[in-house]
Interface confidence: low
């Protein structure tokens, strides 16, 4: 039965669509952005504890106008999905129930048989997400490729196709700076620098504080980072623009230890305000 | 590595204004000084090792009036820009750091009050 | 680690409406959605609602015309507001982290209502 | 909105033995359940999903099985640490909890 009037099985599962995607509520799923290629995903770790795979699973003839050559009923149709060793099968979603295929995976997690049917209709379409488990992904892992290949016991020739996304570690810094004040101004005497003694004969006093937060994991995990200023010291032909004094960096050294930043300030020596000191 | 400065190109030659006396509002001009065309940067460098949750950078500087008073007389107002960013060595090459720089302007005049004495 | 913690007025009138927060460490609001429970005394957990990572919103249809959930994600902060309390309302009120998977993995401690004139 | 009915409300047993909890939802869930262990003053916990998988650190004597409407929780080896309030909860649609079952050792 549902094997035309040759008695003939001939399927024609295909793998209709492939993504990677990610969840935005249990029945929302949004595709991830593609690279240039327009074949691999964009992933960016930055917390997600899991990523979606999309399929969307058809038997339906590959000629319409030749209905009885194929499409015939999949018996014992399945998908069956090997995961690479960054990624676990944690479950499988639909956005109706009613399709949702029974999948099962080994001790590991790492094998994923998914029922589609027995048999899968003439006609049929089932769309499904896979919820892949993302804790193995370690900032080594560059790549992400999930192997996906439709069986059948009805008569129908099945290559393994593969769904592929570059995997980035974005690290969650941001960074913010402000001067206090914001406005200056001068004023007072020409005098040379062999002369200058306390910062105080130099001119009108400004800060600056830049900030760096980090809203994701310890950074000592991702090699060395630093922050960076690039303070305008001179003027092209030389002359003093602005005069470093004091240098000092709060938090990134562990627990109560204050930062070391390169070169040193004040490399004239001048002598400190007392109201600084 | 991630978020390093762009090369410092020779900086560009601005004419120092020499002329300290005087001028008319309306012949004076706006002005900024920007690493690397229009200044010269230092680069102050502070690494971050066990970076959790926030750090802060203060800087404390002062203007050289001399130079403001023998170069920019002429000039109606002065932008200093101070930049700032994040840099990561890693062995890592898929790190992806975004909103990793900053900039901070400071408005420089001539003190409206100041008597100038060369 | 991750955390939640919620805190709120403690006693409200009904003719207020009820405010409680939920604040969170260890994890980031963009990532994860966050639910809201209550238990009345001597009484099993009742589901209020839910806020995804995204903002979406969805709620028990009971309460729905009652009920607003929203968030601050860079304060890292859920907000539960329910309008006309009345002493049905009165209960232990938790938020809970949405494991992804659709169970709530992690809880807060809870925080007690009274609703009194 | 999916019921679930939880039975017994309150059981008694002995330390060693072990018990079993039983809900029943008004419709399929798909295996989307989950179990709780609440003790008064504290936050519940989340000892199994996907109606059989054990959380991280949760001890094997915990277990769980069912499919379609009917799902059944287990505790063998029943130590005092146990005596809590435990719920399903089903995650399909929506969320609903069952009404909880009260353990106590005898």
């Known amino acids: 039965q549902g094997c035309g009037q040759d008695k003939i099985c001939q399927s024609n599962l295909q793998l209709e669509r492939y993504q990677f995607c990610s969840r935005i509520s249990d029945t929302e799923f949004q595709a991830l952005p593609m690279d240039l290629d327009g074949r691999t995903a964009l992933f960016a770790l930055s917390g997600q504890p899991f990523i979606g795979l999309e399929l969307t699973v058809t038997n339906l003839p590959s000629d319409p106008s030749r209905p009885q050559a194929d499409g015939d009923d999949a018996h014992e149709a399945q998908l069956l999905v090997t995961l690479p060793a960054s990624l676990r099968y944690s479950g499988v979603r639909a956005l109706d129930s009613v399709e949702k295929p029974l999948c099962l995976s080994n001790d590991s997690a790492s094998h994923v048989e998914c029922e589609l049917g027995n048999p899968m209709k003439r006609g049929a379409q089932v769309t499904f997400y896979l919820i892949l488990s993302t804790s193995g992904i370690t900032i080594e892992t560059t790549e992400l490729e999930v192997k996906l290949l439709l069986a059948t016991i009805s008569e129908q020739e099945l290559d393994p196709v593969s769904v592929r996304a570059h995997v980035f570690i974005e690290l969650p810094l941001s960074i913010s700076g402000v001067a206090t004040p914001q406005q200056l101004f001068f004023s007072g005497e020409v005098k040379g620098e062999s002369a200058m003694r306390s910062e105080r004969e130099l001119g009108r006093k400004v800060k600056y504080e830049v900030t760096v937060s980090n809203q994701g994991q310890s950074l000592n995990t991702l090699g060395s980072a630093n922050l960076n200023i690039m303070w305008p010291h001179e003027i092209a032909n030389g002359k003093w623009l602005l005069y470093p004094m004091r240098v000092e960096l709060e938090g990134g050294q562990g627990p109560g230890k204050r930062g070391i930043c390169s070169p040193r300030p004040n490399i004239l020596q001048l002598d400190v305000d007392s109201r600084d000191r | 590595e991630l978020g390093q400065p762009e090369p410092q190109e020779p900086p560009e030659k601005v004419e120092p204004s020499t002329s300290w006396w005087p001028v008319s509002s309306a012949e004076k001009r706006n002005m900024t000084l920007d690493c690397p065309r229009t200044a010269k940067c230092v680069v102050f460098s502070c690494p971050l090792y066990s970076f959790d949750r926030a750090a802060v950078l203060h800087v404390w500087g002062r203007l050289w009036n001399s130079t403001f008073l023998e170069e920019y007389m002429a000039v109606k107002s002065l932008e200093v820009i101070v930049r700032a960013n994040i840099t990561v060595k890693s062995s890592i090459k898929n790190l992806l750091l975004r909103d990793a720089s900053t900039v901070i302007p400071v408005m420089v005049y001539l003190d409206p009050m100041a008597v100038v004495v060369e | 680690q991750v955390q939640l913690k919620e805190s709120g007025p403690g006693l409200v009138a009904p003719s207020q409406s009820l405010s409680i927060t939920c604040t969170v460490s260890g994890f980031s609001l963009t990532s994860y959605g966050v639910h809201w429970v209550r238990q009345p005394p001597g009484k099993g957990l009742e589901w209020l609602g839910v806020?995804?990572?995204?903002?979406?919103?969805h709620y028990n249809s009971a309460l729905m015309s009652r009920l607003s959930i929203s968030k601050d994600n860079s304060k890292s902060q859920v907000f539960l507001k329910m309008n006309s309390p009345q002493t049905d309302d009165i209960a232990m009120y938790y938020c809970a982290r949405d494991g992804y998977y659709g169970d709530f993995d992690v809880w807060g401690a809870g925080t007690t209502v009274t609703v009194s004139s | 909105d999916i019921q679930m009915t939880q039975s017994p409300s309150s059981l008694s047993a002995s330390l060693g033995g072990k018990v079993t909890i039983t809900c029943k939802a008004s419709?399929?869930?798909?295996?989307?359940i989950a179990w709780y262990q609440h003790k008064p003053g504290k936050g519940p916990r989340l000892l199994i999903h996907?109606?059989?998988t054990l959380q991280p650190g949760i001890p094997s004597r915990f277990s769980g099985s069912g499919s379609g409407r009917d799902y059944s929780f287990s505790i063998s080896n029943l130590v005092p640490e146990d005596i809590a309030t435990y719920y399903c909860?089903?995650?399909?649609?929506?969320?609903?909890f069952g009404g909880g079952t009260k353990l106590e050792i005898k």
């Open positions: 909860l089903q995650y399909d649609n929506l969320r609903t």
């Open positions: 996907y109606t059989s």
């Open positions: 806020i995804w990572a995204g903002g979406i919103t």
């Open positions: 419709q399929d869930i798909n295996k989307y």
